[in-house]
């Protein structure tokens, strides 16, 4: 017997659906109506036929009471080919729900998203995460999606993007966005970062994550941030192959004084990079290739320094920097 496509945990909290049949029984998902966190994986199916069954132009207000009764707070939709019109229809209906976090992964969005009707209500998300989502509309996808959201988005994560650069002139500002995660876009690079960080569109960013994004030097990142007017408190550059030296012809970059936490772990560094901020609260240099203890003049003024997992560090060795935090145990790097 084939397993049930949807499983609801015994506390009505998590519901997971895996629709792998060519002709799935979508009604099985109704058992998820009481769940708080819902994951729907569509097995790579093309959802185009759905458009024939639903009236994408119907007034979503007729579903308002039904949708308000849903407990869902976090929704993940994955592995499908979705017509943009269907996505928009879902967003319009979900605007009446309690949904706060939406994750889209392994999706191919076909067609263009229609503009938001004047009477429509945007979706009040606090978090939007996209992983391996391709859009037929190319660089304008963020601007098109943004119009269907209320302006209170706090967390935006875009991984494995087919087009990580945005059409900046079309994008409106994200006034409440405090966390931007562009990690796992290895082709982004410092030029791509400049294109993705639309100037003055991200005024409230506190946390910027750029893990595995093809960054080359901290100084190059500093320049991209300065050009965009982005002043994060926390910057994650881990899992990039960083060069410690700076191109002598490159202009010196002044880091924002707002930056107090910098993660340079797993960056293949053989020495402390030049051009770091003068003062930091937290600096993570763990799991690099430092063959000797950094000298005080190589390091910023830092309260909390992590050097675990570097070759020079034998467990139990005296710490090289005042106020540093080191477990003395070499982590699995």
């Amino acid at each position: 017997t084939t397993p049930e496509p949807c499983e609801l945990d015994d506390e009505d909290f998590r519901c997971v659906c895996n629709f792998s049949e060519p002709q799935p029984d979508w009604s099985e998902a109704f058992q998820c109506v009481s769940a708080v966190e819902v994951e729907i994986h569509a097995g790579g199916l093309n959802l185009e036929p759905f458009l024939k069954r639903v009236d994408a132009d119907a007034d979503p207000r007729q579903y308002a009471d039904t949708v308000k009764a849903l407990r869902v707070r976090r929704l993940t939709v994955g592995a499908a080919q979705v017509p943009a019109q269907l996505l928009v229809g879902a967003l319009r209906v979900l605007a009446y729900s309690r949904l706060k976090e939406l994750t889209l992964e392994d999706l191919k969005i076909t067609g263009t998203m229609p503009p938001l009707p004047l009477e429509a209500t945007g979706l009040a998300l606090s978090s939007l995460r996209l992983r391996n989502v391709s859009w037929a509309t190319g660089r304008s996808w963020l601007a098109e999606l943004q119009q269907w959201l209320k302006p209170g988005l706090k967390v935006l994560s875009i991984a494995q993007a087919h087009s990580p650069a945005f059409s900046c002139e079309q994008v409106r500002a994200f006034p409440a966005l405090t966390s931007l995660d562009l990690s796992d876009n290895p082709g982004l690079g410092e030029r791509g970062l400049m294109a993705a960080l639309c100037p003055h569109k991200f005024p409230a960013i506190q946390n910027l994550a750029l893990r595995n994004t093809g960054m080359e030097t901290p100084t190059g990142v500093c320049a991209a941030l300065a050009a965009a007017g982005v002043q994060p408190h926390s910057l994650d550059l881990s899992h990039n192959s960083l060069r410690a030296t700076v191109n002598p012809s490159a202009p010196r970059c002044m880091w924002s004084s707002a930056l107090n936490s910098l993660n340079l772990s797993f960056a293949g560094l053989e020495q402390v990079p030049k051009g770091l901020p003068a003062k930091l609260r937290v600096l993570d240099l763990s799991c690099n290739r430092l063959n000797r203890a950094p000298q005080p003049d190589e390091l910023p003024e830092v309260d909390n320094l992590t050097l675990d997992g570097n070759p020079f560090l034998v467990p139990g060795t005296a710490l090289p920097h005042e106020g540093s935090m080191n477990s003395g145990v070499v982590p699995a790097c």
């Epitope: 945990d9 506390e11 009505d12 909290f13 998590r14």
Partner: antibody, heavy 115, light 111 residues
């Protein structure tokens, strides 16, 4: 059988940050469910503070949201509460609890806010 | 937020009597077929203990003299025949919508 155990200082000074950790045994906090903090001031009723879910998603009581952070350490199967800028009104027994129908409770730890 | 109001504040009964505790919600705590209203018992110095979940389901290990009923906004916890060990404070709680809220409690005393 899932077991939860709170730990942390029993005395915190006003304006400082209260920090508690809940260690979970017999169940992985990344499997499913919500992992909550609930408190009870002496002689009073129960108040939900917030949760971190199996996915890492958080939800907080709006009355405390500006002061609360709930985080987790999946390698230790622990989740933690930080409550900043505490006052005497934050003196309470703090419980860590699994689920949204609260079937599994820690034994609770009394935190007193006093100078 | 959903406000839960419990009544009476105190209930004083004799062993063997039937206890009826009420919980009223400021708005519906139903989501489709389920009522997300739960009942707890708390004895002095102990953590609360789940008695009834989703309005009418008896939590495992709880004696059958405890039962729950109701839907939408009106709920009742019934103890069919009071035992001396039932002296405690009883709380209702809703998990239909965050913030998840508790009633103020009903104190059950034995005469």
């Amino acid at each position: 059988q899932v077991q939860l155990q709170e730990s942390g200082p029993g005395l915190v000074k006003p304006s400082e940050t209260l920090s508690l950790t809940c260690t979970v045994s017999g169940y992985s906090i990344t499997s499913d469910s919500a992992w909550n903090w609930i408190r009870q001031p002496p002689g009073k009723g129960l108040e939900w503070i917030g949760y971190i879910s199996y996915s890492g998603s958080t939800s907080y009581n709006p009355s405390l949201k500006s002061r609360v952070t709930i985080s987790r350490d999946t390698s230790k199967n622990q989740f933690s509460l930080k409550l900043s800028s505490v006052t005497a009104a934050d003196t309470a027994v703090y419980y860590c609890v699994r689920g949204l129908r609260f079937a599994y409770w820690g034994q609770g730890t009394l935190v007193t806010v006093s100078s | 937020e959903i406000v839960l109001t419990q009544s009476p504040a105190t209930l004083s009964l004799s062993p063997g009597e039937r206890a009826t505790l009420s919980c009223r919600a400021s708005e519906s705590v139903d989501s489709y077929v389920n009522s997300f209203l739960h009942w707890y018992q708390q004895k002095p110095g102990q953590a609360p203990r789940l008695l009834i979940y989703r309005a009418s389901n008896l939590q495992s290990g709880i004696p059958a003299r405890f039962s729950g009923s109701g839907s939408r906004t009106d709920f009742t916890l019934t103890i069919s025949s009071l035992e001396p060990e039932d002296v405690a404070v009883y709380y209702c709680q809703q998990s239909n919508e965050d913030p998840y809220t508790f009633g103020q409690g009903t104190k059950l005393e034995i005469k």
